[in-house]
């Protein structure tokens, strides 16, 4: 039960996270005009990864796309790339994890395959989350640098009558959405990796032991132990007897060759 819950929760958390990463990538408010000096502005500027916008106090909003590719700052291109990589990895991870879910049966897919798929999707979610967090953090760092540079310019070179006051930008909503979404995707990925440990049947090293059935004969089903996924160390050897009590995680709905004694 715990493994199924962990896997399911990991999937849901990752799904929310990836949806958030997509939303953040599409949002226009990555940076917003700093209103510290002029809280009642007639023109409010904000910028995203793909276009910059102006909300006029008259109530109209106009956006202009970045139609150039080569003319854009390298950092912005890097952030775009990180976010897109994060989305692609996350989307593939979601696709893989759907088939890996314990509650979904596809033909006679072995638990080992599901465990491997769970691990794969988990790793993808972790990388996806890290990409998003990295992308947002790079953009935030760029904003902080530009903010202090424009602040410095604001208080120098004011000898003439004309003040070319630069518009300063601060963190927009998309940054916070991106950080939270990246974190959720990362947590979801970790949960999937943890679930993978519970899904993988442990490799048992059986010594030559003489079993004596007392009273009545017990049929032993030989072999068929699955190879360990190599994720974590398997110390417990679960011996499950036919007809014995099972935890919900160990119950299988169809007879299987993996009912071990």
């Amino acid at each position: 039960m715990a493994v199924t819950a962990c896997q399911g929760l990991g999937f849901v958390v990752s799904l929310i996270g990836i949806a958030g990463i997509i939303a953040a990538t599409c949002m226009d408010q990555w940076s917003t005009q700093d209103l510290y000096n002029n809280p009642v502005t007639a023109v409010f500027n904000y910028q995203g990864l793909w276009r910059s916008c102006v909300r006029e106090s008259s109530g109209f909003t106009e956006c202009r796309g970045y139609f150039t590719l080569l003319g854009l700052p390298a950092m912005l291109q890097a952030v775009r790339a990180l976010m897109i990589v994060g989305i692609v990895l996350g989307a593939i991870g979601l696709l893989v994890s759907i088939f890996a879910l314990k509650c979904i049966r596809i033909g006679s897919m072995e638990d080992s395959a599901k465990a491997n798929m769970t691990l794969t999707s988990g790793i993808m979610f972790i990388v996806s989350g890290l990409c998003a967090i990295a992308g947002v953090s790079v953009f935030a760092n760029m904003l902080v640098t530009n903010f202090w540079m424009s602040t410095a310019n604001m208080y120098t070179g004011m000898g003439g009558m004309v003040q070319t006051v630069q518009t300063r930008y601060t963190f927009g909503a998309a940054l916070f959405v991106g950080w939270v979404a990246g974190g959720l995707t990362l947590i979801g990925g970790v949960m999937m990796c943890i679930a993978c440990r519970g899904l993988a049947p442990e490799e048992t090293n059986y010594k030559a032991v003489s079993y004596h059935a007392s009273g009545h004969s017990v049929a032993y089903k030989p072999g068929g132990f699955k190879a360990s996924t190599g994720f974590g160390s398997n110390t417990k050897n679960k011996k499950i007897y036919d007809g014995g009590a099972r935890t919900e995680d160990e119950v299988q709905s169809y007879p299987s060759k993996h009912d071990y004694v």
Partner: antibody, heavy 118, light 113 residues
């Protein structure tokens, strides 16, 4: 057709108040800011403030902040500008003007002359 | 507050000649978000309210004759009347819509020489 019709000329005593009205027609009154601008005889244009009738939000020029009150009545599509503690230098033509795309004043009322005289 | 300074205060031009009015802002009026300058030009004839001519520094309002044109960016702007007509005699004002309070230039009186 967009039209802004203002109330008639007023003669006021110093220290009193004046309330000028501006009736809008031909557009969705609640969806556009309404500005008030004044022009003293032979002088330039001076922005006083604005109101968004849909919400009642207002913005005022610092110069008039303490003396001007701008209101709007959505039911009659009318904006009002009240100026208190009148002085002789408040003698001017007061205009209402719709605020539009590009932060411009695209339609103007015909103006209301307010004369402050003892 | 943003200060707009128009020059000259008055201008006399012969009919059919070119008239140029300047407007200088104490601060940039260029918006980074849409790369537009929030400067507007109005024409006011005696006894009438102002009439919108040009917005965003260079966009002509519909119905305005094409002899009127606006140019400039940042802090320096120009209104040009390519061929002055008798009906163009008026006072011309520039106005900024970039920051509150909204401000106007002091006006330029255009007359026929």
């Amino acid at each position: 057709e967009v039209q802004l019709v203002q109330s008639g000329a007023e003669v006021k005593k110093p220290g009193s108040s004046v309330k000028v009205s501006c009736k809008a027609s031909g557009y969705a009154f609640s969806n556009y800011w309404m500005n008030w601008v004044r022009q003293a005889p032979g002088q330039g244009l001076e922005w006083m403030g604005q109101i968004y009738p849909g919400s009642g939000d207002t913005k005022y020029s610092g110069k008039f902040q303490s003396r001007v009150t701008i209101t709007a009545d959505k039911s009659t599509s009318t904006a009002y500008m009240e100026l208190s503690s009148l002085r002789s230098e408040d003698t001017a033509v007061y205009y209402c003007a719709r605020f539009y795309y590009g932060n411009v004043m695209d339609y103007w009322g015909q103006g209301t002359l307010v004369t402050v005289s003892s | 507050d943003i200060v707009l300074t128009q020059s000259p205060d008055s201008l006399a031009v012969s009919l059919g000649e070119r008239a140029t009015i300047n407007c200088k802002s104490s601060q940039t009026l260029l918006s980074g978000g849409n790369q537009k300058n929030y400067l507007t030009w109005y024409q006011q004839k005696p006894g009438q309210p102002p009439k919108l001519l040009i917005y965003w520094a260079s966009t002509r309002e519909s119905g305005v004759p094409d002899r009127f044109s606006g140019s400039g960016s940042g802090t320096d702007f120009t209104l040009t009347i390519s061929s002055l007509q008798a009906e163009d005699v008026a006072v011309y004002y520039c106005q900024q819509g970039y920051s509150y309070p909204l401000t106007f230039g002091q006006g330029t009186k255009l007359e026929i020489k």
